[in-house]
């Protein structure tokens, strides 16, 4: 009933009812991408598939240019998994060379951009030191939580190093949000 | 109101309203597994507790023979955590023996089976290389995301090695889904 | 409509409809902890920010004294991430000393307390061995699942070692729940 319900006039309507099926929702899946030059301490954003395979956007939740656009204000559950993989960890080389043993790391950040606000807001961060003994390593970072978002907010997923992202399968690296 | 709402006849009903309490939901918890022979490159499915302790199924969401049965079409949030544990990592032994340093791995896949479709669909995968230095290791892999499912779809959780799954506690290894 | 709907008297009302916007919800974020003495085998509970920054509680979901209070019975999705970090892993020191190589571990438990029930119930546990080669390590543990809760239940997050919890950023360590 598109967020409206007809009730007897004597009843106080505290909040509109709405059908669950018409709530904004999206599940985006990974596509291959190679990093462009990016500024130090500024993590690049991932680009996503939004309509093929398992990916979809619905009910005015749109995807454009690395961003999920929030079409209406409310509480959203937002989630992402990024699977990373690498050939070797420099950590072991640094260790052997006798230099300070500062491990490498992999990081995922789900970021909110509000046009009226100068700085992006980091909603969720998953960060992990990587100091693998093996020559080939791979591992996922999963994030998910609920946030109050405003119409017009934009969501993106940033990573510490795009070249380490496993883009080979749509079930390994993904990003989604839905209105509760 | 079981997905129906009575509204004045002049109103356009875009989508049925339905009470949240009658939506299909399940939370399944780990039980001790019987390792079965499985074909190479075909991960075995876990079976689950569906009614004791923290586990439940409700509103026509049924569990049978390792599968969660989807009773109605819609968007579902699906999740699982599998905790793995092992005594040693063969990785270190392989390394010491001078063989190629290919790390072992642990993998969880949430799979959808549709009877009318010949191949299962992998919805979610969490995969991690394991090359632990310690003689005893343990770690969880968590997955969760939203998918559009059809009535009659079946969901299962597959793992790379059933013998590494920690089945000792219902809070360590679990599987669930709920209609949004 | 606050859980009520007016329907023709001849209709069977199976379950009340209610507006999504008035459901109990909370997202809590990390604050600096004061390490407290705790009994052996009894993990300390974290306390949380509940109103500043990204944190909020709404619709009668209240936070008090390390607990989220459940204001109405129903099925809730509960989640938490705790990011741990440490300077060194004693594991390597233990190994070098020739003692049994039992790795250290980090553990998160989401616990339910019901006043009428003598023992807390562990709903979710994420536990991981830590045997890092690097001198500085950090990693998150994420948990999330659905549970049937009763009005008056209390939820808390317990960790194996408060001193290892990364409290520096609200996006790294958090705890939330919402009525489905």
């Amino acid at each position: 009933l598109k967020g409206q319900e007809f009730a007897p006039s004597h009843q106080q309507v505290y909040a509109p009812l709405r059908a669950d099926g018409d709530k904004p929702r999206a599940h985006l899946t990974v596509v291959r991408q190679t990093p462009t030059q990016h500024f130090k301490n500024q993590f690049p954003a991932l680009h996503w598939e939004h309509e093929l395979g398992l990916a979809f956007t619905k009910n005015r939740m749109n995807y454009t240019n690395k961003f999920l656009l929030i079409p209406e204000s409310g509480d959203y559950f937002i989630y992402s998994q990024v699977t990373f993989r690498g050939m070797t960890s420099e950590c072991s080389e640094i260790r052997q060379a006798g230099r300070p043993n500062k491990p490498d790391s992999i990081t995922v950040v789900i970021t909110k951009v509000t046009d009226s606000y100068p700085e992006p807001t980091q909603l969720l961060m998953g960060t992990k030191s990587v100091c693998e003994v093996g020559s080939n390593w791979f591992q996922p970072i999963y994030l998910g939580a609920m946030f109050s978002l405003q119409e017009g907010d934009k969501l993106m997923v940033n990573v510490s190093d795009i070249s380490l992202v496993d883009y080979t399968k749509e079930d390994k690296t993904f990003f989604g949000a839905f209105l509760l | 109101l079981k997905g129906q709402e009575f509204a004045p006849s002049h109103q356009q009903v875009y989508a049925p309203l339905r009470a949240d309490g009658d939506k299909p939901r399940a939370h399944l918890t780990v039980v001790r597994q019987t390792p079965t022979q499985h074909f190479k490159n075909q991960f075995p499915a876990l079976h689950w507790e569906h009614e004791l302790g923290l586990a439940f199924t409700k509103n026509r969401m049924n569990y049978t023979n390792k599968f969660l049965l989807i009773p109605e079409s819609g968007d579902y949030f699906i999740y699982s955590q599998v905790t793995f544990r092992g005594m040693t990592s063969e990785c270190s032994e392989i390394r010491q023996a001078g063989r190629p340093n290919k790390p072992d791995s642990i993998t969880v896949v949430i799979t959808k089976v549709t009877d009318s479709y010949p191949e299962p669909t992998q919805l979610l995968m969490g995969t991690k290389s394991v090359c632990e230095v310690g003689s005893n290791w343990f770690q969880p892999i968590y997955l969760g995301a939203m998918f559009s499912l059809q009535e009659g779809d079946k969901l299962m959780v597959n793992v790379s090695d059933i013998s590494l799954v920690d089945y000792t506690k219902e809070d360590k290894t679990f599987f669930g889904a709920f209609l949004l | 409509l606050k859980g009520q709907e007016f329907a023709p008297s001849h209709q069977q009302v199976y379950a009340p409809l209610r507006a999504d916007g008035d459901k109990p919800r909370a997202h809590l974020t990390v604050v600096r902890q004061t390490p407290t003495q705790h009994f052996k085998n009894q993990f300390p509970a974290l306390h949380w920010e509940h109103e500043l920054g990204l944190a909020f509680t709404k619709n009668r979901m209240n936070y008090t004294n390390k607990f989220l209070l459940i204001p109405e019975s129903g099925d809730y999705f509960i989640y938490s991430q705790v990011t741990f970090r440490g300077m060194t892993s004693e594991c390597s020191e233990i190994r070098q000393a020739g003692r049994p190589n039992k790795p250290d571990s980090i553990t998160v438990v989401i616990t339910k307390v019901t006043d009428s029930y003598p023992e807390p119930t562990q709903l979710l546990m994420g536990t991981k061995s830590v045997c890092e080669v690097g001198s500085n390590w950090f990693q998150p543990i994420y948990l999330g699942a659905m549970f049937s809760l009763q009005e008056g239940d209390k939820l808390m997050v317990n960790v194996s070692d408060i001193s290892l919890v990364d409290y520096t950023k609200e996006d790294k360590t958090f705890f939330g729940a919402f009525l489905l």
């Epitope: 596509v31 991408q33 190679t34 990093p35 680009h47 093929l52 050939m87 070249s163 883009y167 080979t168 | - | -």
Partner: antibody, heavy 119, light 108 residues
Framework: EVQLVESGGGLVKPGGSLRLSCAAF????????MNWVRQAPGKGLEWVGL??????????DYAAPVKGRFTISRDDSKNMLYLQMNSLKTEDTAVYYC??????????WGQGTLVTVSS | ENVLTQSPGTLSLSPGERATLSCRAS???????LVWYQKKPGQAPRLLIY???SRATGIPDRFSGSGSGTDFTLTISRLEPEDFAVYYC?????????FGQGTKLEIK
């Protein structure tokens, strides 16, 4: 600034061999898949083949007309891409371009090198 | 292989007019891997659009791309004299990568 510079083109007889090189500047070469593309005189663009990054096992893939005759390789330490062309045919006459293959994102091209196969 | 068919083969228009170029694929593929190039004699192809709709660096905003699945379009809203060239679409989602046969945009 991203730059790709091809070299090694020239005149060769049918059945002969030639090795093209492509020097890459201004980006992390080892992360990027690389393609060879060609354009025969008066014809359209034609994909020749690709080599993936080492992270993706460095595997190669080729268009049907050149499979078994052409080999793509790379030397990440020198930021160099190569195309070894054997058993050349007159229909291999074209301008050969090396290009980046970044997946989603901007791809870059060299200026091309002319290969003429003629007796 | 995924065959890309461009239409029309030749498009005769005057400066200031709007040009609409079509690219149709024989198989569905991700729009992330659809690009449009401009090619002039003696020059390397110039990337105009990547990901079906994202303008490459330095490309004027009169160039726009759209489409998904199997049908893609390049639009030049107001033709300038320097826009007359051959335009190619390419997919690189599935191997073998393929180009369309090209659309020649000529001055009327």
């Amino acid at each position: 600034e991203v730059q790709l510079v091809e070299s090694g083109g020239g005149l060769v007889k049918p059945g002969g061999s030639l090795r093209l090189s492509c020097a890459a500047f201004g980006f992390t070469f080892s992360n990027v898949w690389m393609n060879w593309v060609r354009q025969a005189p008066g014809k359209g663009l034609e994909w020749v083949g690709l080599i993936k990054s080492k992270t993706d096992a460095g595997t190669t893939d080729y268009a049907a007309p050149v499979k078994g005759r052409f080999t793509i390789s790379r030397d990440d330490s020198k930021n160099m891409l190569y195309l070894q062309m054997n058993s050349l045919k007159t229909e291999d006459t074209a301008v050969y371009y090396c290009t980046t293959d970044r997946g989603w994102g901007e791809n870059y091209w060299g200026q091309g090198t002319l290969v003429t196969v003629s007796s | 292989e995924n065959v890309l068919t461009q239409s029309p083969g030749t498009l005769s228009l005057s400066p200031g007019e709007r040009a609409t170029l079509s690219c149709r694929a024989s198989q569905i593929f991700s729009s992330s891997y659809l690009v449009w190039y401009q090619k002039k004699p003696g020059q390397a192809p110039r990337l105009l659009i990547y990901g079906a709709s994202s303008r490459a660096t330095g490309i004027p905003d009169r160039f726009s791309g759209s489409g998904s699945g199997t049908d893609f379009t390049l639009t030049i809203s107001r033709l300038e004299p320097e826009d007359f060239a051959v335009y190619y679409c390419q997919q690189y989602g599935n191997s073998p990568y393929t180009f369309g046969q090209g659309t020649k945009l000529e001055i009327k």
